[in-house]
């Protein structure tokens, strides 16, 4: 079965600043990632980012810079300033569909006791739904 | 509701500029990719140009370089500046959105653009 | 770029036909394709998306099928408001391109 991880980073230099990285678990091949926040894509969370393998990368404030890390995970930066920015309880959600397997999501949130610059290893999270 | 409002279409000669414009409605306009297509007469449709939600661009291969898309996201406004029109620039332009990724969903009447002498 | 051949160009049916258009892309595009509906004088209209699944509102005689290269629109019982020209789409990669259309005419 699929599985989507998820890890959410504070940077030790910023510590309003987060870094996203999500991965997707499976022998499909991805044809979109969602990031969020707030909760999953389509149940009351914020899209933050959408990459497409073929056609590029949409980022909404306050993400600054979404990449593909590998062909099945991709890393997301937060700018930390403004009225905008996400604090140490954000719920981050990405969201891979895959073909032929469909979708899967996962969340994670900055660990509770993590320090500035730490975080915890890339595990798999929950898996929220699979359309 | 939902709404895509071409207007700016018109009889231009060879060589002339035109400038489409496209005001939306109904929709968070920032949070969708736009799209210009056309469809010269009795012809199918012709995939013309697309912008991001932060203005990444990409176009035809043989508008390249004469058209350039904009969108003014304040505004909720999507714009087609044509240049070095030619001929076979005649056609119904049509200002479509989509939401990125996942396909062309909401279209508008469209306006007409002629290209003769 | 991605050609996308529809088939057949035009089709002659009376109402209560099923009616198949078939779209072929020259590479696999996953399912990253939609059908679109165009009547004379007015912009296409979506049916399908994601190559399988029906636009909300959009009557369940539509149905789309297909992944990879081989793509079908099928209406199941035509009606007369369903004499029209037919489009796929394929998002896939730059520059988008459509299908020729198919032309669904009364027999």
């Known amino acids: 079965t699929p599985e989507v991880w998820v890890q959410v980073r504070m940077e030790a230099t910023e510590l309003s600043s987060f870094t996203i990285r999500c991965g997707f678990l499976g022998s499909g091949s991805i044809s979109l990632v969602t990031v969020s926040w707030g909760g999953p894509n389509g149940a009351g969370g914020t899209t933050l980012a959408v990459l497409h393998p073929e056609r590029g990368i949409r980022q909404w404030a306050p993400a600054r810079q979404a990449r593909w890390e590998t062909q099945s995970s991709i890393s997301l930066i937060l700018e930390g300033s403004g009225a905008s920015s996400p604090c140490a309880n954000t719920t981050f959600c990405c969201k891979f569909a895959s073909f032929p397997e469909g979708s899967w999501e996962a969340c994670g949130s900055l660990p509770p006791s993590s320090d500035p610059g730490l975080s915890a290893p890339p595990t798999p999270a929950p898996i929220l739904r699979a359309d | 509701e939902v709404q895509l409002v071409e207007s700016g279409g018109g009889l231009v000669q060879p060589g002339g500029s035109l400038r489409l414009s496209c005001a939306a409605s109904g929709f968070t306009f920032r949070n969708y990719d736009m799209h210009w297509v056309r469809q010269a007469p009795g012809k199918g449709l012709e995939w013309v140009s697309d912008?991001?939600?932060?203005?990444?661009?990409y176009y035809l291969g043989s508008v390249k370089g004469r058209f350039t898309i904009s969108r003014e996201n304040a505004k909720n406004s999507l714009y087609l500046q044509m240049n070095s029109l030619r001929a076979g620039d005649t056609a119904v332009y049509y200002c479509v959105r989509e939401e990125f990724g996942y396909g062309m969903d909401v279209w508008g009447q469209g306006t007409t653009v002629t290209v003769s002498s | 770029d991605i050609q996308m051949t529809q088939s057949p160009s035009s089709l002659s049916a009376s109402v209560g036909d099923r009616v198949t258009i078939t779209c072929r892309a020259s590479?696999?595009?996953?399912?990253?394709l939609g059908w679109y509906q165009q009547k004379p004088g007015k912009a296409p209209k979506r049916l399908i998306y994601a190559a399988s699944s029906l636009q909300s509102g959009v009557p369940s005689r539509f149905s789309g099928s297909g992944s990879g290269t081989e793509f079908t629109l099928t209406i199941s019982s035509l009606q007369p408001e369903d004499f029209a020209t037919y489009y796929c789409l394929q998002h896939l990669n730059y520059p988008l391109t459509f299908g020729g259309g198919t032309k669904v005419e009364i027999k």
């Open positions: 912008i991001g939600n932060s203005g990444e661009t």
């Open positions: 590479q696999g595009i996953r399912n990253d």
